[in-house]
C-alpha cells in the first residue's frame, strides 16, 4: 500500500485532514500528548480502520477500548474504506489517560478521497483503474513485469504535413490519438473539496522534452484535446469538479531511448492543500505512473516479408523485373522509387532500415533513416514515413559520416539463446574496424549509442573495415530453416570456392570460364584462377577476416558449425588493401520468406549449368528455399554492391512482445 502523509493530532483544537483511499496514513499521537498522560485509546467512525503496533513487543491489536502506552515505540496507522460524502464526515477520537487526571480528548476529522492516476500498467491494451499503489512507480521487465508503455508518435497521420505528429502540439484526429497511450485520472471527493485543494499534473524537468500530454475535453460535438504537459510545460493545474469524475489524458513520447535517456518517464499528480490563503500550498498526496518508451526493433530475414523497396535507375529494367517477380512469388507489396526521386542513388539498403515500435494497444512500422544522405536522402521522410509509418534518424545530418554509417552495415540476427541468456528478438549486428587508427572507419557513435539504448537487441560489433565498402551484408546473411534454430547463418567463403574450383579442375574442367556472357569483361579460366598466387594470398587474408567474424558470431549468437553454411565466394584486394567481391557476391541476397534473390555469379558453365549456382542450390534447397539468380552485374556489381544493397524489406513484427523479455 502506498505511503500517505503524517497527521499530528493535538488536544488543543480539532485536526482536519485528508486521507486518500489506498494509502496508509501515519498518526502522531505522542508529540502533543498532555504531559501527565501515560497511555491512550482510540475510537473511530465505521469508515476508518486504525492499526496500532507496539514495538517491542511487535504485537498488534485492533481498536476498541484497549489502552496503549504513550511511548516512541507505538505506531498508529489508519486507512479509509470509502470516499467521504462530505468534508470531515469521518472521525477519529484519541483519548489520553493519566493516573491522576480525567481523559483528555483530541479530535481528528477525516475526509476520505479517491485520487488515482491509471494507465495500462498490466500491458493488456486496456486501462484498469488502480488505487495508489507502490508498484505503479516502478517499471519491470518480463512476463510478470508491469509498467505502462509509450510510443514515440513519430508517424505522419496528416499527409499534408511534412513533420512527424510529435513535432506539433495538436491532435489531428482519432487516428493520431491511437498512437498515444491513455492515462486516466479518477477522483471521488466531496462536492466542495476542490475549493480548498488543487491537483497538479507534472513531469520532471529532465523528462519534459521527452513527452507530451494532451487532456481530452469532451465537448458536445467532438472530443477535443489540448496540451497540458510538454517540452515547454513541466506542470499543469487541473480544473477538477467535486464528486465522482474521470479525466482522460493521451500521452505521446517525443524521443526514443538514447545515451542520456533510459526511456523511462514518470507522470505525477500532486494534491495540494490550498485552504490557507496566506500560506504556501502544501503537498498532501502524490500518485505516479511510470511509462517506458517503446524501443525501435529490427526484424531479421526470418520474419515474413510484407513490402519490398527498390530503385528504378538507368538501364536496370531487367533487375527490376526479377525483383518484381520475386516479390510476387513471396506475396509482397512492391514499392519502386523512380529515377527522379532517387537522384541516381540505387542503394536502397544503405539509406534506411525498417523496424517497428510496439505498445499493447498499437504496433507501428518505423523507418530508421541513415545519415549517409546521398541521392535517396528524401525517400524515407517523403515516401516511407506517413500515416501509421514512423520515422527516426540519428547521426550528423551534414558530413562527418563514413561508409560504415550506411545500413548495409546494419543487420539483425534471428532470435537466439546464448548459454542461459535469451535474445528473443535477436541481436543487432554492425561492422567496425578491429582497432581505431588514423584512417579506420567505424559506425558513428550516435548510431551505436542509439542502437544500444534500445536494450532489447543487444548489439554485436563485427569486423568489416577490411572491405572496400565495409558492410556486414558483404559477408553474411541469414535464411530461414525448418530445423535446428530455425535459421542458418550464411557466410561468404573463399575456401569453399577454391575447393569447388579445384574439384572442377580435377574433373577436367580447368578451361571452363568465369564471366562467360559478360561483355567487356576479361573471362577467367578456372585453372588461371587456381594458379594466381596473388589472388590466393588475397583470399587467404579475406578468409582470416571472415573467420574472425565467424568465431565472434558463434560466441555471441550461440551458434554451432552446423548452424553455418559456407557460400563459395572469391574476393580481390583493391586500393588500400580493401576487399571487394571478385564475382557477384552471392551472400548479398534478398531473402523473402522461402524465396531468395541471389546475385547471379556468372561462374564457370559445366555440363550446361553454372557450377557456383549449382553448389549454392545444393546447400539451400534442402532447407525448402527457392533460389532465383538475378543478373545485377552491370547495374550493381561493378558499382560495388549487389541485390541486397539495392533493395530493402519491411517485415512482419515479432509475435513476441518486447516487454516480456529481460534484457
Amino acid at each position: 500500500m502506498a505511503q500517505g502523509t503524517l497527521i499530528r493530532v493535538t488536544p488543543e483544537q480539532p485536526t482536519h485532514a485528508v486521507c486518500v483511499l489506498g494509502t496508509l496514513t501515519q498518526l502522531d499521537v505522542c508529540s502533543s500528548a498532555p504531559e501527565d498522560c501515560t497511555s491512550f485509546s482510540v475510537n473511530t467512525s465505521p469508515g476508518v480502520v486504525v492499526d496500532i503496533a507496539h514495538s517491542p513487543p511487535a504485537k498488534k491489536k485492533s481498536t476498541g477500548s484497549s489502552t496503549w502506552p504513550l511511548d516512541p515505540g507505538v505506531e498508529v496507522t489508519l486507512t479509509m474504506k470509502a470516499a467521504s460524502g462530505s468534508t470531515g464526515d469521518q472521525k477519529v477520537q484519541i483519548s489520553y489517560h493519566g493516573p491522576k487526571t480525567p481523559p483528555v480528548k483530541a479530535l481528528l476529522y477525516l475526509t476520505g478521497v479517491e485520487i488515482s492516476l491509471s494507465a495500462d500498467i498490466t500491458r493488456t491494451g486496456k486501462v484498469k483503474p488502480t488505487r495508489a499503489v507502490e508498484d505503479k512507480r516502478t517499471w519491470t521487465w518480463g512476463p510478470c513485469g508491469q509498467g505502462a508503455i509509450l510510443l514515440v508518435n513519430c508517424d505522419r497521420d496528416n499527409p499534408e504535413s511534412s513533420a512527424m505528429d510529435c513535432e506539433d502540439d495538436e491532435v489531428l484526429d482519432s487516428k493520431d490519438l491511437k498512437d498515444m497511450s491513455l492515462m486516466t485520472l479518477s477522483t471521488k471527493t466531496p462536492q466542495d473539496f476542490f475549493t480548498r485543494h488543487t491537483l497538479v499534473l507534472h513531469v520532471a524537468r529532465s523528462e519534459m522534452d521527452k513527452v507530451r500530454v494532451f487532456q481530452a475535453t469532451r465537448g458536445r460535438l467532438s472530443s477535443r484535446c489540448r496540451v497540458v504537459l510538454g517540452p515547454k510545460q513541466p506542470s499543469h493545474y487541473l480544473m477538477v469538479p467535486g464528486g465522482k469524475h474521470n479525466m482522460d489524458f493521451y500521452v505521446e513520447a517525443l524521443a526514443f531511448p538514447d545515451t542520456n535517456f533510459p526511456g523511462l518517464i514518470t507522470l505525477t499528480v500532486s494534491m495540494l492543500d490550498t485552504s490557507k490563503l496566506e500560506l504556501p500550498e502544501a503537498v498532501v498526496f502524490q500518485d505516479s505512473v511510470v511509462f517506458r518508451v517503446a524501443p525501435w526493433i529490427m526484424t531479421p530475414n526470418t520474419q515474413p516479408p510484407q513490402e519490398v523497396y527498390v530503385c528504378s535507375i538507368f538501364e536496370n529494367e531487367d533487375f527490376l523485373k526479377s525483383v518484381t517477380a520475386l516479390a510476387m512469388q513471396a506475396r509482397c507489396k512492391l514499392t519502386i522509387c523512380p529515377e527522379e526521386e532517387n537522384m541516381d542513388d540505387q542503394w536502397m539498403q544503405d539509406e534506411m532500415e525498417i523496424g517497428y515500435i510496439q505498445a499493447p494497444h498499437k504496433t507501428l512500422p518505423v523507418v530508421f533513416d541513415s545519415p549517409r544522405n546521398r541521392g535517396l536522402k528524401e525517400f524515407p521522410i517523403k515516401r516511407v514515413m506517413g500515416p501509421d509509418f514512423g520515422y527516426v534518424t540519428r547521426g550528423p545530418q551534414t558530413g562527418g559520416v563514413s561508409g560504415l554509417d550506411s545500413f548495409g552495415n546494419l543487420e539483425v540476427s534471428p532470435p537466439v539463446t546464448v548459454g542461459d541468456k535469451e535474445y528473443p528478438l535477436g541481436r543487432i549486428l554492425f561492422g567496425d574496424s578491429c582497432y581505431p587508427s588514423s584512417d579506420s572507419r567505424e559506425m558513428h557513435q550516435a548510431l551505436q549509442d542509439f542502437l544500444s539504448a534500445q536494450q532489447v537487441q543487444a548489439p554485436v560489433k563485427l569486423y568489416s573495415d577490411w572491405l572496400t565498402v565495409g558492410h556486414v551484408d558483404e559477408f553474411l546473411s541469414f535464411v530461414p530453416a525448418p530445423d535446428r534454430k530455425g535459421f542458418r547463418l550464411l557466410l561468404a567463403s573463399p575456401r569453399s570456392c577454391y575447393k569447388l574450383f579445384q574439384e572442377q579442375q580435377n574433373e577436367g574442367h580447368g578451361d571452363a570460364l568465369l564471366f562467360q556472357g559478360i561483355k567487356k569483361k576479361n573471362q577467367q579460366k578456372i585453372k588461371n584462377i587456381l594458379s594466381n598466387t596473388t589472388l590466393r594470398e588475397h583470399n587467404s587474408f579475406v578468409e582470416r577476416c571472415i573467420d574472425w567474424n565467424r568465431e565472434l558470431l558463434k560466441r555471441e549468437l550461440g551458434l554451432a558449425e552446423s548452424d553455418i553454411i559456407d557460400i563459395p565466394q572469391l574476393f580481390k584486394l583493391k586500393e588500400f588493401s580493401k576487399a571487394e567481391a571478385f564475382f557477384p557476391n552471392m551472400v548479398n541476397m534478398l531473402v523473402l520468406g522461402k524465396h531468395l534473390g541471389i546475385p547471379k555469379p556468372f561462374g564457370p558453365i559445366i555440363n550446361g549449368r553454372c557450377c557456383l549456382e549449382e553448389k549454392v542450390c545444393s546447400l539451400l534447397e534442402p532447407l525448402g528455399l527457392h533460389c532465383t539468380f538475378i543478373n545485377d552485374f552491370y547495374t550493381y556489381h561493378i558499382r560495388h554492391g549487389e541485390v541486397h544493397c539495392g533493395t530493402n524489406v519491411r517485415r512482419k513484427p515479432f509475435s513476441f512482445k518486447w516487454w516480456n523479455m529481460v534484457p
Epitope: G403, V469, K572, L573, K574, E575, F576
Partner: antibody
C-alpha cells in the same frame, strides 16, 4: 579520358576556410579514384587526400587530418576538398588528380596510389 | 623534409642515360610494388611516366624505365633529349599513417 578542372582557391586569413572543387568532364567521375596533391611555391609535391570510386572510404595526410575533408558528389561529377583552420603552411597550388577504378583488374593494380590524370591546379594563399 | 629521398639534381648530355634514385624504407618502397614517377615542367601540372615500379602509361616513350631493389626505386632515362629537362618526383604507397608519400624531387638538367 577524363579532364579535371580545379576551382575555389584564393586568399584567406589564417584560421579561415575554403572549399575547393574538382569538376570532371569527358567521363563519369564515379568510375575514378580521386586524390588532392599540393605544391608549395618553389617546393615539391605533397599528397593531401584520397577518396575511392565507391565513395566508401577516405584517407588524409597527417598534416591535414582533422582539418580537411574530402567528399564527392557523383551526380555533379565533382569532388571537393573542404579546408578548415587554414595555416600559412597550407599555402600551395592544389591539384586534383585521378585514376580509373578498373573493375577488370584481377588483383590490386595500385591505381589509388598513382595519378594518371591531373588538373591545372588552383592557388590557395593563407596570409594575414 | 620529404619521406622518400631523391638527389636534388642530376644532369646528362643529349643521348646519354641518367638514373634517378628514390630511397624509402621497408614500410613503403621496400614493401609495396606501388612506386610511381612523375615529370613536371616549370609552371605545368605533373605527368605520370611510370607506375607500379616499371609500367609505362600509353604515350610515354620507352626511353623511360623503372626498377626497384630493396628499399630503393630507380628511374632511368636513356637517350636523353632536351625536352626531358624537368623536375622528377617519385611516389610510393606507405603503411604509415600518411598512405602516399612523395620524394623531394630531382631537377634534371640536359647539358
Amino acid at each position: 579520358q577524363v579532364q579535371l578542372v580545379e576551382s575555389g582557391g584564393g586568399l584567406v586569413k589564417p584560421g579561415g576556410s575554403l572549399r575547393l572543387s574538382c569538376a570532371a568532364s569527358g567521363s563519369t567521375l564515379s568510375d575514378y579514384f580521386v586524390s588532392w596533391i599540393r605544391q608549395a611555391p618553389g617546393k615539391g609535391l605533397e599528397w593531401v587526400s584520397f577518396i575511392n570510386a565507391a565513395n566508401t572510404f577516405t584517407y588524409y595526410a597527417d598534416s591535414v587530418r582533422g582539418r580537411f575533408t574530402i567528399s564527392r558528389d557523383n551526380a555533379k561529377n565533382s569532388v571537393y576538398l573542404q579546408m578548415n583552420s587554414l595555416r600559412a603552411e597550407d599555402t600551395a597550388v592544389y591539384y586534383c588528380s585521378s585514376a580509373n577504378d578498373d573493375v577488370d583488374d584481377i588483383v590490386a593494380p595500385g591505381r589509388g596510389y598513382y595519378m594518371d590524370v591531373w588538373g591545372r591546379g588552383t592557388l590557395v594563399t593563407v596570409s594575414s | 623534409q620529404s619521406a622518400l629521398t631523391q638527389p636534388r639534381s642530376v644532369s646528362g648530355s643529349p643521348g646519354q642515360s641518367v638514373t634517378i634514385s628514390c630511397t624509402g624504407t621497408s614500410g613503403d618502397v621496400g614493401r609495396y610494388s606501388h612506386v610511381s614517377w612523375y615529370q613536371q615542367h616549370p609552371g605545368k601540372a605533373p605527368k605520370l611516366i611510370i607506375y607500379n615500379v616499371y609500367e609505362r602509361p600509353s604515350g610515354v616513350p620507352d626511353r623511360f624505365s623503372g626498377s626497384k631493389s630493396g628499399n630503393t626505386a630507380s628511374l632511368t632515362i636513356s637517350g636523353l633529349q632536351a625536352e626531358d629537362e624537368a623536375d622528377y618526383y617519385c611516389s610510393s604507397h606507405s603503411r604509415s599513417s600518411t598512405p602516399v608519400l612523395f620524394g623531394g624531387g630531382t631537377k634534371l638538367t640536359v647539358l
